[in-house]
């Protein structure tokens, strides 16, 4: 019989196990209409061709219908995320039908066999939908399939096989192994529904990627670059959950997609926004915080259908837990000159002061070298809503490129402790808020004193709105 094993190390082994050890099971897919928010409630099982359970269980033909599709299982039981998602859907859409697709017997297999079963399960869902379409008032446009991991590809098959087009499929970290690079008919793809949105939370460019890396929807959202999720590092896991195993880290990151979706349902007033970008590095540089031409969108349930979009990669940063929303800022800092810099690479730190709150001291992540006499762009994000920005405090430190230079700097400092020596000249900082799309320019508080040495601080105050230069107009932007 199937036995538990950790998802990453052992999954790699699973892909190469002989077929002989698979378990013989009765092929079965069940549809459980969750009629109560109480997770213990047994719900109602729908049966193809039998209309009575639909009436007995109060299936609402005119309402939205959600099908939740789980993935591969090591234990053969429903995981804890399931009832969290059911409850969140019931909370958000009180009249909706929430159906759990139970394909546990076919998912509680070797991973390779579970993959081979996805087509059969997708077909079963399509047949159920075809039957429901025969009923008065039932519309396929009101159907939203939500698939986690392997379940995302099951949803793809269902959307492909059904007569007509389902309204929406949400892929929650669709499974990677055996699907990466696969033909569009053998994985989730934009053709499978009127709108296919995808959250990618466990992708790896080296090693085994549990989640699929390639874009497979109309919009593909990569929170935190789609790889390392905050609160899921080994240290976080050791601290907060006392687990400390790689398995738990994998589970935390893979399952984060579900929690981001749940967050979008229950924290409607705190929507997270993602921004279109060609790649994660450009996003980390703060280049991609535009909402023009539908370049930004809410994530999860609140995502807006983008017309003519296909495989649009979008990025955002998040907090480590619910509510996941953060506030993104693009910072443009023009470094006018270096003085006595040697081989020192500066690291900037900013503290933002706003009408609502002040941020912590935030490091500006350096994706590429800091350029002299050039405008350098950074991405900064805060966990709290600062309100309107009023002022910025900037400091910097130097990270030496070699031990020799470090010794040289130390010797110089010890011989002339009051002569800072190294200086940067920064006169203004331009800031753009991702969430409000507002652009502000901050000027040095003392225009005569714009040089800053390591460990010292420079203050900038708002000097004007926008970044307009001569003959330049700034379009007004509406967030979706």
């Amino acid at each position: 019989s199937p036995t538990p094993f950790g998802p990453e190390g052992q999954l790699a082994d699973e892909l190469h196990k002989p077929k002989a050890i698979q378990t013989e099971v009765k092929p079965s897919v069940r549809f459980n209409l969750r009629t109560s928010k109480d997770p213990e409630h047994e719900g109602c099982y729908l049966s193809l061709g039998h209309s009575q359970p639909l009436e007995d269980c109060g299936f609402n033909m005119t309402a939205k219908t959600f099908f939740i599709i789980h993935g591969w299982t090591m234990s053969g039981i429903f995981e804890n995320w399931l009832h969290k998602l059911v409850s969140a859907l019931h909370t958000r859409e009180k009249d909706a039908n929430v159906v759990v697709v139970d394909w546990l017997p076919l998912a509680h297999q070797l991973y390779t066999d579970a993959v081979n079963n996805t087509r059969v399960v997708g077909h079963s869902i399509a047949r159920m939908l075809d039957w429901l379409q025969e009923k008065d008032d039932f519309s396929l446009g009101n159907v939203h399939l939500i698939g986690y991991s392997l379940g995302a590809h099951v949803a793809g098959y269902a959307g492909n096989f059904v007569k007509g087009t389902v309204g929406r499929i949400t892929g929650l970290d669709p499974a990677g192994p055996m699907f990466e690079g696969a033909d569009i008919h053998k994985r989730l793809s934009p053709d499978d529904a009127d709108f296919v949105d995808v959250l990618h939370t466990y992708t790896r460019s080296f090693g085994l990627s549990i989640g699929i890396q390639m874009p497979v929807g109309h919009i593909d959202i990569y929170p935190n670059g789609g790889d390392f999720q905050p609160g899921c590092g080994l240290n976080d896991v050791l601290g907060s959950m006392a687990y400390g195993t790689i398995t738990e880290v994998v589970k935390c990151e893979h399952e984060r997609a579900v929690h981001l979706f749940v967050d979008s349902l229950v924290n409607q007033d705190k929507p997270s926004f993602a921004f279109q970008c060609t790649d994660s590095n450009r996003f980390k540089k703060g280049i991609c915080l535009s909402c023009r031409k539908n370049r930004c969108n809410s994530i999860g349930y609140n995502a807006k259908k983008m017309r003519n979009k296909r495989n649009s990669k979008m990025y955002l940063k998040t907090r480590a837990g619910m509510p996941f929303r953060v506030y993104h800022y693009q910072m443009k800092i023009h470094v006018f000159s270096y003085k006595n810099m040697g081989e020192i690479e500066p690291t900037f730190y900013v503290t933002l002061y706003g009408t609502n709150a002040d941020s912590q001291t935030l490091p500006l992540e350096i994706v590429e070298r800091i350029e002299q006499n050039a405008t350098n762009t950074f991405l900064v994000y805060t966990e709290e809503d600062l309100g309107d920005l009023l002022k910025i405090q900037l400091t910097w430190e130097g990270a030496s490129q070699s031990w020799y230079n470090l010794w040289k700097e130390l010797r110089s400092y010890l011989s002339q402790p009051h002569n800072p020596g190294r200086e940067l000249n920064i006169r203004r900082i331009r800031v753009k808020s991702g969430e409000t799309q507002r652009k502000l320019t901050f000027c040095a508080e003392d225009p005569e004193n714009t040089s800053i040495s390591p460990g010292r601080e420079l203050w900038f105050r708002k000097c004007r709105d926008g970044w307009r230069m001569k003959n330049e107009t700034s379009p007004t932007v509406e967030l979706p």
């Epitope: 079965s28 804890n80 017997p105």
Partner: antibody, heavy 120, light 112 residues
Framework: QIQLVQSGPELKKPGETVKISCKAS????????MNWVKQAPGKGLKWMGW????????TYTDDFKGRFAFSLETSASTAFLQINNLKNEDTATYFC?????????????WGQGTTLTVSS | DIVLTQSPASLAVSLGQRATISCKAS??????????MHWYQQKPGQPPKLLIY???NLESGIPARFSGSGSGTDFTLNIHPVEEEDAATYYC??????????FGGGTKLEIK
């Protein structure tokens, strides 16, 4: 009302086989998983594993792999625990207990227990 | 596997007083705000009976003198005021996600 009724006490010799039954009533049998729990004399509770009552797929904990088998007779709403090649250390009371597939997996209803004595 | 350690192994409490039983888990049994820790009562010759589920929820039909609390790795079952019929062995159990699910070693409560 919901009930789980187990078969009566068993006295067996080492090397023999025993099959304990657990008949469910008052609810839809296939809508809840069935657990098996062992309690040796004067000892605590030890979870042996469970069986999916719809698919018939059993899951065993490491200590109960090999000689132990969970099975079903769905039409009779009955779950079975079979122990082969009995050993003295199998002497215990065995309980069946149901749990909800969808919730937090606690065991809300239990059978009265079947006492198995293995002695030569 | 998650190991549950109950303490004390046994305790004697006077009628009407408070009985407090502790259960410590080797790992957190919390998941997204819920604690997957449950408490059972077992009297001699009887099967266990569910008292508290998800750390603090009282099972229907169980008297309100039973209460559960805790999160993460530390959980407590309180009985107040203790009655004669509460003499039994009490077990904690965790069912956090992937099996194996485990029971604590039990605490025997005697009424003085």
């Amino acid at each position: 009302q919901i009930q789980l009724v187990q078969s009566g006490p068993e006295l067996k010799k080492p090397g023999e086989t025993v099959k304990i039954s657990c008949k469910a009533s008052g609810y839809t049998f296939t809508n809840y998983g069935m657990n098996w729990v062992k309690q040796a004399p004067g000892k605590g509770l030890k979870w042996m594993g469970w069986i999916n009552t719809y698919s018939g797929v059993p899951t065993y904990t490491d200590d109960f792999k090999g000689r132990f088998a969970f099975s079903l007779e769905t039409s009779a709403s009955t779950a079975f625990l079979q122990i082969n090649n009995l050993k003295n250390e199998d002497t215990a009371t065995y309980f069946c207990a149901r749990f909800s597939y969808y919730g937090r997996h606690y065991f809300d209803y239990w059978g009265q227990g079947t006492t198995l004595t293995v002695s030569s | 596997d998650i190991v549950l350690t109950q303490s004390p192994a046994s305790l004697a409490v006077s009628l009407g007083q408070r009985a407090t039983i502790s259960c410590k888990a080797s790992q957190s049994v919390d998941y997204d705000g819920d604690s997957y820790m449950h408490w059972y009562q077992q009297k001699p010759g009887q099967p266990p009976k569910l008292l508290i589920y998800a750390a603090s929820n009282l099972e229907s039909g169980i008297p309100a003198r039973f209460s559960g609390s805790g999160s993460g790795t530390d959980f407590t079952l309180n009985i107040h005021p203790v009655e004669e019929e509460d003499a039994a062995t009490y077990y904690c159990q965790q069912t956090n996600d992937d099996p194996p699910w485990t029971f604590g070693g039990g605490t025997k409560l005697e009424i003085k």
